[in-house]
Structures are given as C-alpha cells and as structure tokens.
C-alpha cells in the first residue's frame, strides 16, 4: 500500500521521496531492503538519505531495488517502500514506455506541461524542453518556472515532451531528464445557462388514479464535458429524498449527447399508484450548473378513463 515506483537513468541524479509522509521534525531512516543495510546520511556518499528524501548522485544501474523508509513519529514507526529502477541510457531517440511519466492533456485554453518530479530537486531556471528529442524553438513555446506553455495548441503538438534540468548539490551539478506524453483535446467545450427541454413551463400532465406515471426532466448544459451539471425533481420545494413518500422516486436517465453535440441529462420521476393527493402537489424540474438554476413547474390533473359504455 505505502509503496511507490521510481525510475531514472544511469549517470543522472535521482531523488526519491518516502511514500510515508510526516512532520519535518520526524526522523526518517532508510534501508536497502534486500540486505537490511542502513543508507548513510553523510553527503559524501554517492547514495545517501536526507530526511524524507533518498538521493542517488548520480544513479547507477546497480542501485535498482527496493528501499525501505521508516518515519518515526511520537507514537508509531511508519514504514514505506520505494521501488527504484535505474535504466541504461538509450542510444536512440525513442523513450521507452517504462521511462514515461503520466500523460497530460491540453487544449487551446490550457496547454501547460509540468516537468515531472522537479519539485524534489534543487534546480534553477531555465528548463530545457524537447519534443520527440528535438529542442523546442520558436515563440509558441515558453518555458515558465517548472512547466512549458504552448501557445495556440494544435493537434500536431501531441507527442512526447522531455524536460532537462540541472540539480545542484553542494556545488556539484547533476543532469536530470523526465519525459511525459502530451495529448491535445480537439473538441472545444463550453457551458451555458441550463435549457430545459422537457417538461414545458407550467405543463399540465394528465394521469390516471391508481396507475403509474412517469415525468421526465431533461435539460442541456453546453457542449463537451461539463464540470458541474445536474437535473433533479422537487416536490413542493422539497428534495424527493426528504419528502418521504416512497411511492415517488427519481431515477437517473441516460446522459444524452444529441446530434448537435450538446451535453444533456435526464431525470425520471416515477409515481407508483397515483393518488388523489398527488394532484395537489407542485412538481418542479430543476436544472443547474455553474451559470445558475432553471426551474419548470408541472402539475398533475386527473385523466378520466375512456368511457366504454355504448
């Protein structure tokens, strides 16, 4: 559970944080799990422990293995494991999957690519950035603090981005590289004030006493993924769950995406065994998102059964 994978390249710096956290005042001891040998804290060693951090300056393939950290709190010794793998440098340009950090997505509005793990290192700007091993040049690319900003992102900007920086430890410099994939979301989503498609405002719905009835609240909220959107029913201004009538329940319908790409939601109100008193209630279909709330009110009226007498 408290285990973390870390990886790096030989002859580069690698700094690993203990998967268990703790107050800065807590002592942290590090061990090489295979031998149970304590990792020294003296900085003259190539591999040494510094509180919650384990530093390989620089890393060697032989350093690969599982390292145990024990955070000593006043009450418990909390154990974590760092699974470290150091790889040989590739001669060609391709970065293998096992060296890749998590993929990030961007769009025209948000195209930041953060340099993975950089916060663990003592580095100074600027960062160097590469895409598919080519140094990034041109005014569209801006290295800002620990991330890369791409202006006017296009589909062709998708690919593998590598950041390169220098870690400084007691005057000695060590190179670090980290690579992650960047994907471009081509659809441009937007949200708008909710539009209720059904029911119509102040609609009268005919129902038969003793039968079941369904009311559907359907609303659209914009295009693309919506951050916050909901449809729900209220009875006399009260949430269905709080109203306390087990015969009346709401049930989520399907997320709908119409041909025009709008993001819409349904909520079905099911009334079992309609009773006279149900006709006295006010049924509100509510649609809400970050823009606001829209309400359409429905009332029920008695539908006279068809007269079959001749």
């Amino acid at each position: 559970k408290f285990s973390k994978q870390s990886w790096g390249l030989e002859n580069e710096a690698l700094i690993v944080r203990c998967p268990r956290q703790g107050k800065p005042s807590y002592t942290v001891d590090w061990y090489y799990s295979q031998t149970n040998k304590s990792i020294p804290t003296q900085e003259r060693n190539r591999v040494f422990a510094s509180g919650q951090l384990l530093k390989f300056l620089p890393a060697a393939v032989a350093d690969s293995g599982i390292y145990t950290c024990i955070v000593r709190s006043p009450t418990f010794n909390r154990t974590g494991y760092a699974n470290v793998t150091i790889y040989k440098k590739q001669s060609d340009c391709n970065v293998p999957d096992y060296l890749m950090y998590s993929t990030v997505s961007g769009s025209e509005k948000n195209s930041k690519i953060y340099c993975p793990t950089i916060d663990l290192y003592n580095w100074t700007a600027p960062l160097e950035w590469f895409k598919n091993c080519q140094a990034l040049q041109g005014s569209r690319y801006r290295a800002h603090k620990s991330f890369l900003v791409i202006d006017n992102v296009m589909t062709e900007d998708a690919g593998d981005y590598t950041c390169k920086f220098i870690h400084n430890e007691n005057g000695a410099n060590y190179s670090v590289t980290a690579t992650r994939s960047f994907t471009v979301k081509d659809e441009q989503g937007f949200s708008l004030f909710p539009v209720i498609g059904a029911p119509a405002q102040n609609e009268i719905k005919e129902v038969e006493i003793g039968k079941n009835a369904n009311l559907t609240c359907s609303a659209c909220f914009g295009k693309g993924t919506q951050f916050l959107a909901a449809v729900l029913w209220q009875l006399n201004g009260t949430k269905i769950t709080d109203f306390g009538e087990p015969r009346i329940q709401q049930e989520e319908g399907q997320n709908q995406s119409f041909s025009n790409g709008l993001a819409c939601l349904d909520m079905v109100l099911r009334i079992a065994d309609v009773k006279e008193e149900d006709l006295l209630l006010q049924y509100d279909c509510l649609a809400l998102n970050l823009h606001g709330l829209r309400r359409h009110t429905v009332r029920l009226s008695r539908k006279n059964p068809i007269d079959h007498h001749s």
Partner: antibody, heavy 121, light 106 residues
Framework: QVQLVQSGAEVKKPGASVKVSCKAS????????MYWVRQAPGQGLEWMGA????????AFNQKFKGRVTMTADKSTSTAYMELSSLRSEDTAVYYC??????????????WGQGTMVTVSS | DIQMTQSPSSLSASVGDRVTITCSAS?????MHWYQQKPGKAPKRLIY???KLASGVPSRFSGSGSGTDYTFTISSLQPEDAATYYC?????????FGQGTKLEIK
C-alpha cells in the same frame, strides 16, 4: 463521510474488565491509526494509546501499559479497547478518535460519540 | 511526560470580546492542536499544527506560538463559543492535553 460509532454504556465492578468497540466507516479502516482518549467526569482529556489496524502495532501511554489491550478487526472495520483490573478512578467516557491525515498527525479530527464506563461496587 | 498548563482555568467574557487562552508546555514542542468541547459532546478540532484552521471552523478562531508557549484566540466572541477549550501536543509520547479552559458568556 468518516464515522466512528462506539458501543453502549457499561457498568462494571472493581477488578473486572471492560471492552469498548469502535466501528469505523466512510474511509479505508487500515489506512489510519485509531487512538483512544478518556475523560473522567468533570475532568480533562487523557490519551491512553493507539493501534495501527494494518499491522496490529500498538502505542501506549505508560500509565496504562499492562492494563490496556488494543485490537482491530479488519473484516468488520472495528477497533477494540479493553481495560482490565478496573478501579473506581477508571469511571470515564472513553472515546475512539483518529487524525485527519494519518501520516502528518494533524490533531484528532474525527471522534466517536463516547462510551460511558462506570466502575462501582 | 510533557505537562501542558493552560491559563486561565476559567473565564467569563461578553459577546464581541477578544478572548485569549495560553498553553505552556514543560518542554519544547513542535506544534500545538486546539479543541473545543461542549457538555455531553465529543471534542471538536479547531486549530491544528499551531495555526491552521480546521475545515468548517469560523475564522474568528486562531492560534500561534512556538517552543513552549502557545496562544489560542477568539477575535470576537459569539454566544455559541461557550465551551471548554483544550490544547494538545503531539511531539512526544505520551500525547498530552492541557487541563482545559472553561469559557462562559457574561
């Protein structure tokens, strides 16, 4: 949401033992240590000890060591505190409690409702 | 054991008053936590790590301090603040609480 529900009030005779339970819900039981704090009538709070449900490791206030046993049942997400050789001064409300963030010890953020234990002959 | 001494043991103040409670540790601690307890209820965490406000706690509550001396402040006392307040250290085993400060509204 995080909930800690404790067993009901107990009346015990001096020399007896009492076992208080604390059922956790709303989070992964083995991710957080469970602590026990007691409060005698009209008095302040006193930390008794704690258990790590994942490993079974325990930590105690030396004042209670030898008299208190803490256990955890992972299958039911329940922690137990048993206090033996009861005396009248053990009459108190016993609380189970846990930190907000287990590793950073940011104070006791979640508390059970308390279990009143009365020791009387 | 680290002894925690709160002062005053009790106090009475009016709505709108600024109220300060101090907690003195018998040896240096790194952080202090503060709790509020009302009769018949479990304690409630108000301040953690000396000065951080717990989620959902009004901003009139604050904390400060370092070493052996810590302070808890209510900037503008409200009627619902009538309670007993406790400090607690988590720097050394056993974890210890102050004896409490009972706050009454005049």
């Amino acid at each position: 949401q995080v909930q800690l529900v404790q067993s009901g009030a107990e009346v015990k005779k001096p020399g007896a033992s009492v076992k208080v339970s604390c059922k956790a819900s709303g989070y992964t039981f083995t991710d957080s240590e469970m602590y026990w704090v007691r409060q005698a009538p009209g008095q302040g709070l006193e930390w008794m000890g704690a258990i790590d449900p994942e490993t079974g490791d325990t930590a105690f206030n030396q004042k209670f060591k030898g008299r208190v046993t803490m256990t955890a049942d992972k299958s039911t997400s329940t922690a137990y505190m048993e206090l033996s050789s009861l005396r009248s001064e053990d009459t108190a409300v016993y609380y189970c409690t846990r930190a907000f963030d287990n590793d950073n010890d940011e104070g006791f953020a979640y508390w059970g409702q308390g279990t009143m234990v009365t020791v009387s002959s | 054991d680290i002894q925690m001494t709160q002062s005053p043991s009790s106090l009475s103040a009016s709505v709108g008053d600024r109220v300060t409670i101090t907690c003195s540790a018998s040896s240096s601690v790194n952080y202090m936590h503060w709790y509020q307890q009302k009769p018949g209820k479990a304690p409630k965490r108000l301040i953690y790590d000396t000065s951080k406000l717990a989620s959902g706690v009004p901003s009139r509550f604050s904390g400060s301090g370092s070493g052996t001396d810590y302070t808890f402040t209510i900037s503008s006392l409200q009627p619902e603040d009538a309670a007993t307040y406790y400090c607690q250290q988590w720097s050394s085993n056993p974890l210890t609480f102050g004896q409490g400060t009972k706050l009454e509204i005049k």
